[in-house]
């Protein structure tokens, strides 16, 4: 192990230098380990499982946004192995608080039961 090598680097025995770990393609995540000077002989990249995605590199697969369950929004674009889901307008019975600052997830829809009078998404 070479402690001078970075998080995503291994010690190349041939050159004696730190070398970048091979990055994974979008839709894949690293399997086994590479970094801080060492690389498993069988290090590789495996596909993201269902409901997860990765932009590649050294990123692990992350779960798609749950538009309906968490955001109470419609699904504009379902996620795949390479892309997160994109959420659309609120589900029926929910409305968007436009003046709220976005949280780390983006906009969240709130129940019309909590809506101020005459909220357009909740009228009718």
């Amino acid at each position: 192990e070479d402690s001078n090598c970075g998080e995503n680097e291994y010690h190349n025995q041939t050159t004696g230098l730190c070398q970048q770990c091979p990055p994974c393609r979008p839709g894949e995540e690293p399997y086994m380990s590479c970094g801080y000077g060492t690389k498993d002989d069988d290090y590789g990249c495996v596909p993201c499982p269902a409901e997860k995605f990765s932009k590649g590199g050294y990123q692990i697969c992350r779960r798609h946004k749950d538009c309906e369950g968490f955001f109470r929004a419609t699904v504009l674009t379902p996620g795949d192995m390479e892309n997160d889901a994109e959420c659309g307008p609120c589900l029926p019975g929910y409305y968007m608080l436009e003046n709220r600052p976005r949280n780390i997830y983006g906009m969240v829809c709130y129940s019309c039961l909590l809506a101020p009078p005459n909220t357009k998404e909740c009228v009718g």
């Epitope: 091979p22 994974c24 002989d41 069988d42 590789g44 495996v46 596909p47 993201c48 192995m81």
Partner: antibody, heavy 119, light 107 residues
Framework: EVPLEESGGGLVKPGGSRKLSCAAS????????MHWVRQAPEKGLEWVAY????????YYADTVKGRFTISRDNAKSTLFLQMTSLRSEDTAMYYC????????????WGAGTTVTVSS | DIQMTQSTSSLSASLGDRVTISCRAS??????LNWYQQRPDGTVKLLIY???RSQSGVPSRFSGSGSGTDYSLTISNLEQEDVATYFC?????????FGGGTKLEIK
């Protein structure tokens, strides 16, 4: 040019031994993990053994463990399968196959060599 | 070990047909599913890797899909040269295992 070429097959008596070879060309052999896969007559494919690029990781199917030995000579770009205590059920076409770099599948296959175990 | 099952051992279709070959794993293999074509002369070739990705040089009429335990290979416009046996393979866990194969013939 054929990237993988197996040799060493033939007729062997039960209990006998045989060494198969797989000559690689047209790519940097030492960069790739390699597998042996076999196919009994009129049957499906069966994974037999794997050796990583630097020989630090070696795995066998339970059906051949203790009887078969996979090895490689990176300087000669050659993969080997030493088979001992052969049984009739080892009769098959034996393929060597390359593991794609960073991936867990076989991206290039040889044409195969036939081993027949019979008295 | 993970068992791979190809429920159809042989099928016959006409030129130009759309053909789907299915494969089921005994447990979730997280899209680590590959498809191989074995021609009548014994030649084996990788078609699709990691469920849906085409190996370079493979005609676009071959496509793959699925997730979890259920996967399929589709040939959208059957040609004479597609006469072969098709095998699925899981690369998730050693020992690697294959389906029993589906032999495709032309009517």
């Amino acid at each position: 040019e054929v990237p993988l070429e197996e040799s060493g097959g033939g007729l062997v008596k039960p209990g006998g031994s045989r060494k198969l070879s797989c000559a690689a060309s047209g790519f940097t052999f030492s960069d790739y993990g390699m597998h042996w896969v076999r196919q009994a007559p009129e049957k499906g494919l069966e994974w037999v053994a794997y050796i990583s690029s630097g020989s630090s990781a070696i795995y066998y199917a339970d059906t051949v463990k203790g009887r078969f030995t996979i090895s490689r000579d990176n300087a000669k770009s050659t993969l080997f399968l030493q088979m001992t205590s052969l049984r009739s059920e080892d009769t098959a076409m034996y393929y060597c196959a390359r593991r794609e770099i960073l991936r867990y599948y076989f991206d290039v296959w040889g044409a195969g060599t036939t081993v027949t175990v019979s008295s | 070990d993970i068992q791979m099952t190809q429920s159809t051992s042989s099928l016959s279709a006409s030129l130009g047909d759309r053909v789907t070959i299915s494969c089921r794993a005994s447990q979730d293999i997280s899209n680590n599913l590959n498809w191989y074509q074995q021609r009548p002369d014994g030649t084996v070739k990788l078609l699709i890797y990691y469920t849906s990705r085409s190996q370079s040089g493979v005609p676009s009429r071959f496509s793959g899909s699925g997730s979890g335990t259920d996967y399929s290979l589709t040939i959208s416009n059957l040609e004479q040269e597609d006469v072969a046996t098709y095998f699925c393979h899981q690369g998730k866990t050693l020992p690697y295992t294959f389906g029993g194969g589906t032999k495709l013939e032309i009517k």
